[in-house]
């Protein structure tokens, strides 16, 4: 466990021409606040998860009134850090979104109004416990300067906050096999000992003495497979003897969603579906009108002229939620072919193709006949998503590169003997048979079923198959 900390240093006009108009005026004084959203991973998949590492809102900054005629300066900022606690290991790579919001404090009916001024995003590598990292990001004509770090909460230490430390029992050194806990040299690394008997295959622990079960296993030592057939409770019923899940506390217990929001569990945490007029991680932001721009991702806001009348966001294709903040799961239609992995990036669908396949939907089989040569005069034959080479006589193998033994298939009938020949094979027929493969019997009266043998070739002579 630990905390991601964000310190905003300045928010103001960026360098270069086209300085932005001040967001505040004498008629409409305002103040700023910030929102940070963190997602695990550097990769494109990070776009799929909604603030899976956590999110935080800053306090409101000092009230600012623009001086007439003066250029927009750096705007006064809220005090303090934005802190995003994380319960599990720090992932080391993460994506962030930092939003700058304006709160207008004019005499409008119904209290303050909010609007989004700027949004910046990026992907970074960061080890927990390291120094502050400085960054500058630009959004349009605005520039945001900030620092960030991740730090572990005791007793966790390490670059991922997964090692545990405890005070030394002896002043001089740590116990056998245990290292000092840098940078806390007066402490020792604590061995992570799970509860005695905890199944090594189906259980794990994040704190000493506990035994947490992997999905599909239950019981105090995670040794009982879950069977849902006799289970009645919503999250699975109750006893270790029946092998049913005990409904322990879940992330939605006590409903963390405010203002009538409904909670649904996600693999990492929970997600709130907010009623109209509210949004935020826990539906805590309220009093919003269309003037505040509450519809994300290009949604069109309708109605909501004042805070008492609800607005409606008409979402663009691919987005949903009362504020168009959620992405439709297009991957559920499995558009990627040939076992490709689907990634919904919002602006586009991407397919990660398995080896041997390519194309935007993994539709091209790289092993097909296109651009493929069969050696030694063989011809390529496609079929069933694969290909094969039909080889010329005397050659075999996947690409017709191997010299084939023409006699391997025993081509000479009726006991004829096969001889390999540079141009193919020769059959020496047993008495009473003739033909290239000894397939024709010689009639008892000396005539064959074929026209008379060519001059100089008696029945029984070897026949060469060209």
């Amino acid at each position: 466990a630990g905390v991601f900390e964000l310190q905003i240093h300045s928010f103001g006009p960026g360098p270069g021409p086209g300085a932005p108009r001040s967001p505040c005026s004498a008629r409409l004084p305002c103040r700023l606040f910030f929102r940070v959203c963190l997602k695990p991973g550097l990769s494109e998949e990070a776009a799929e998860s909604p603030c899976a590492l956590g999110a935080a809102l800053s306090a409101r900054g000092p009230v600012y009134t623009e001086q007439p005629g003066a250029p927009a300066p750096d705007l006064p900022l809220p005090d303090g850090l934005l802190q995003v606690p994380f319960r599990d290991a720090w992932p080391g790579t993460f994506s962030f979104i930092i939003e700058t919001w304006r709160e207008e404090l004019g005499d409008q009916i119904g209290g303050p109004a909010w609007s989004l001024l700027a949004r910046v995003a990026g992907r970074r590598r960061l080890a927990a416990g390291g120094p502050w990292a400085r960054d500058i990001q630009r959004a349009g004509a605005w520039e945001l300067r900030f620092s960030y770090r991740a730090r572990c909460e005791p007793p966790a230490v390490g670059t991922a906050c997964t090692r545990l430390c405890r005070p030394r029992s002896a002043p001089s050194r740590c116990g056998p096999g245990l290292r000092p806990c840098a940078p806390l040299e007066d402490e020792c690394e604590a061995p992570l000992v799970c509860r005695a008997g905890c199944s090594p295959e189906h259980g794990f622990c994040e704190q000493p003495g506990e035994c947490r079960c992997l999905e599909g296993w239950t019981g105090p030592l995670c040794t009982v497979p879950v069977s849902t057939s006799s289970c009645l409770s919503p999250r699975g019923p109750s006893s270790a003897t029946t092998g049913c899940l005990v409904p322990g506390p879940g992330p939605c217990d006590g409903n963390p969603c405010a203002n009538g929001g409904s909670c649904s569990e996600t693999p990492r945490s929970f997600e709130c579906t907010c009623p109209r007029g509210f949004y935020g991680l826990r539906c805590e932001v309220s009093g919003v009108t269309c003037a505040d721009g509450p519809c994300f991702n290009g949604g069109l806001c309708v109605g909501g002229a004042d805070p008492d009348s609800a607005y409606i966001c008409h979402c663009p294709p691919g987005f949903q939620g009362s504020n168009c903040e959620k992405r439709v799961d297009r991957c559920s239609l499995q558009p990627c072919r040939n076992g490709g992995l689907c990634l919904d990036l919002g602006h586009a669908l991407r397919c990660r193709c398995r080896a041997g396949f390519a194309g935007p939907r993994c539709e091209h089989d790289l092993d097909d006949c296109a651009g493929r040569a069969c050696a030694n005069g063989g011809t390529c034959v496609e079929g069933g998503g694969a290909h094969r080479c039909s080889c010329a006589l005397g050659f075999g193998g996947r690409d017709c590169r191997e010299r084939a033994d023409p006699c391997a298939a025993r081509p000479c009938a009726h006991g004829g003997r096969c001889y390999a020949h540079f141009s193919g094979l020769v059959c020496a027929c047993a008495p009473g048979y003739m033909g290239a493969r000894c397939e024709f019997p010689v009639h008892p009266d000396g005539a064959s079923a074929l026209p008379a043998a060519p001059p100089g070739l008696r029945p029984g002579d070897p026949q060469r198959y060209l």
Partner: nanobody
Framework: EVQLVESGGGEVQPGGSLRLSCAAS????????MGWYRQAPGKQRELVAG???????KYAESVKGRFTFSRDNAKNTVYLQMSSLRAEDTAVYYC??????????????WGQGTLVTVKP
């Protein structure tokens, strides 16, 4: 540009039936995947049924045995035959298609949606 036009929505009593149609038109090189999603008030949009990139037909668990998905390749049209309808099937039903506009370019398209209401 590709257009998806849905039809067949309406109001029906529980246990009743409806048949939705969705026709794709425009610059279509080939259709990679196509199907039906639905969105009930206050809920997430979810897949109902469709054919996948590999040509398999896929159904949501909640509609298996009640809804039948079919397609007419020659007309670039898909259908959803909905039987034994329940109140919880009430939603806006959207047609979706993953379409190659040429050999190497593919895009996702949504229809405008058609409302299905199931009430006594």
């Amino acid at each position: 540009e590709v257009q998806l036009v849905e039809s067949g929505g309406g109001e029906v009593q529980p246990g009743g039936s409806l048949r939705l149609s969705c026709a794709a038109s425009g610059s279509i090189f080939s259709i990679n995947a196509m199907g039906w999603y639905r969105q009930a008030p206050g809920k997430q949009r979810e897949l109902v049924a469709g054919f996948t990139g590999d040509g398999m037909t896929k159904y949501a668990e909640s509609v298996k045995g009640r809804f039948t998905f079919s397609r007419d390749n020659a007309k670039n049209t898909v259908y959803l035959q909905m039987s034994s309808l329940r109140a919880e099937d009430t939603a806006v039903y959207y047609c979706a298609a993953d379409v190659f506009t040429d050999r190497d370019h593919v895009d996702w398209y949504w229809g405008q949606g058609t409302l299905v209401t199931v009430k006594p």
